[in-house]
Interface confidence: low
């Protein structure tokens, strides 16, 4: 396959509601019509797929209905949002971009974004 450069931020802190957003930008060497974006999580030497979406250039990303990811695309960059994160989900989130069609196939893998998730402190009971 052919290599393609993918850039993503080194560190992102999830919000108190467990939402983390980051940009995944790729240097497209050709005129792709169909692009696949996959978010991988690396923790303890294990790589697991978090979510994936395929989109036509110029159109919106469509993740599966039950996906924890949402995203929008603009040119050669994808804005990814991961929801429902908890402290145990802290890890390195890698953006993988594939120019699926037409051939030749291009693959780009980012260095990963370290997402830190801190579970919010439970609210103390209030007496009314």
């Amino acid at each position: 396959c052919k290599a393609m450069h993918v850039a993503q931020p080194a560190v992102v802190l999830a919000s108190s509601r467990g939402i983390a957003s980051f940009v995944c930008e790729y240097a497209s060497p050709g005129k792709a019509t169909e692009v696949r974006v996959t978010v991988l999580r690396q923790a303890d030497s294990q790589v697991t797929e978090v979510c994936a979406a395929t989109y036509m250039m110029g159109n919106e990303l469509t993740f599966l209905d039950d996906s924890i990811c949402t995203g929008t695309s603009s040119g050669n960059q994808v804005n990814l949002t991961i929801q429902g994160l908890r402290a145990m989900d802290t890890g390195l989130y890698i953006c993988k971009v594939e120019l699926m069609y037409p051939p030749p196939y291009y693959l780009g893998i980012g260095n990963g974004t370290q997402i830190y998730v801190i579970d919010p402190e439970p609210c103390p009971d209030s007496d009314f």
């Epitope: 396959c1 050709g30 036509m56 069609y101 037409p102 051939p103 030749p104 196939y105």
Partner: antibody
Framework: EVQLVESGGGLVQPGGSLRLSCAAS????????MHWVRQAPGKGLEWVSG????????SYADSVKGRFTISRDNSKNTLYLQMNSLRAEDTAVYYC?????????????????WGQGTLVTVSS | DIQMTQSPSSLSASVGDRVTITCQAS??????LNWYQQKPGKAPKLLIY???NLETGVPSRFSGSGSGTDFTFTISSLQPEDIATYYC?????????FGQGTKVEIK
């Protein structure tokens, strides 16, 4: 076993139409880009058409553009090639071929699986 | 389109001989070159990918080398079952193009 089986070939008159099918089995058909490659009698291999794994993107060789239409039905694991306005020079064995696509951290790009081919003869 | 030129178009060699086929691309294709074997009446079969990588299950007597525009395919010791036509194919630029083929026969 990974397998591709073409069908639908036969004898057709110039200007006629034919629809080729390629039934896939033994792999996740919907994850792969699929292509048609043909071989005229005693000649070499010529790429004809390709379709992305989703079916939303297609490409054609200049020699068949506007006359051939590639499509796929992922629910039936089947690839199609609708051939219209056929010419004598379209006479060939038509192979469907899988363009290697596996969603790993390493990827490859070549035709790794081929069908046995189906013969299309255009003659009056 | 990238033109692929194979030579020779045919050759005849004895069992045990070393056989070499060359493939030249009309422009630099890095190492994005694949080799296929096609036996009479059969579909092509992938032997070598990315110029030098042997496909799983392919005998080690087959090998490939080269980069840029000039590539070589070698059968180190020709066997009777190697009678076939061999094709190179570039995977660098769309559309894919094949060489015209080299027919290998036994003397």
């Amino acid at each position: 076993e990974v397998q591709l089986v073409e069908s639908g070939g036969g004898l057709v008159q110039p200007g006629g139409s034919l629809r080729l099918s390629c039934a896939a089995s033994g792999f996740t058909f919907s994850s792969y880009s699929m292509h048609w490659v043909r071989q005229a009698p005693g000649k070499g291999l010529e790429w004809v058409s390709g379709i992305s794994f989703s079916g939303r993107s297609t490409s054609y060789a200049d020699s068949v553009k506007g006359r051939f239409t590639i499509s796929r039905d992922n629910s039936k694991n089947t690839l199609y090639l609708q051939m219209n306005s056929l010419r004598a020079e379209d006479t060939a064995v038509y192979y469907c071929a899988r363009y290697l696509m596996s969603f790993n951290l390493t990827r490859t790009s070549w035709f790794d699986v081929w069908g046995q081919g189906t013969l299309v003869t255009v003659s009056s | 389109d990238i033109q692929m030129t194979q030579s020779p178009s045919s050759l005849s060699a004895s069992v045990g001989d070393r056989v070499t086929i060359t493939c030249q691309a009309s422009q630099d294709i890095s190492n994005y070159l694949n080799w296929y074997q096609q036996k009479p009446g059969k579909a092509p079969k992938l032997l070598i990918y990315d110029a030098s990588n042997l496909e799983t299950g392919v005998p080690s007597r087959f090998s490939g080398s080269g980069s840029g525009t000039d590539f070589t395919f070698t059968i180190s010791s020709l066997q009777p079952e190697d009678i076939a036509t061999y094709y190179c194919q570039q995977g660098d630029a769309w559309p894919w193009t094949f060489g015209q083929g080299t027919k290998v026969e036994i003397k």
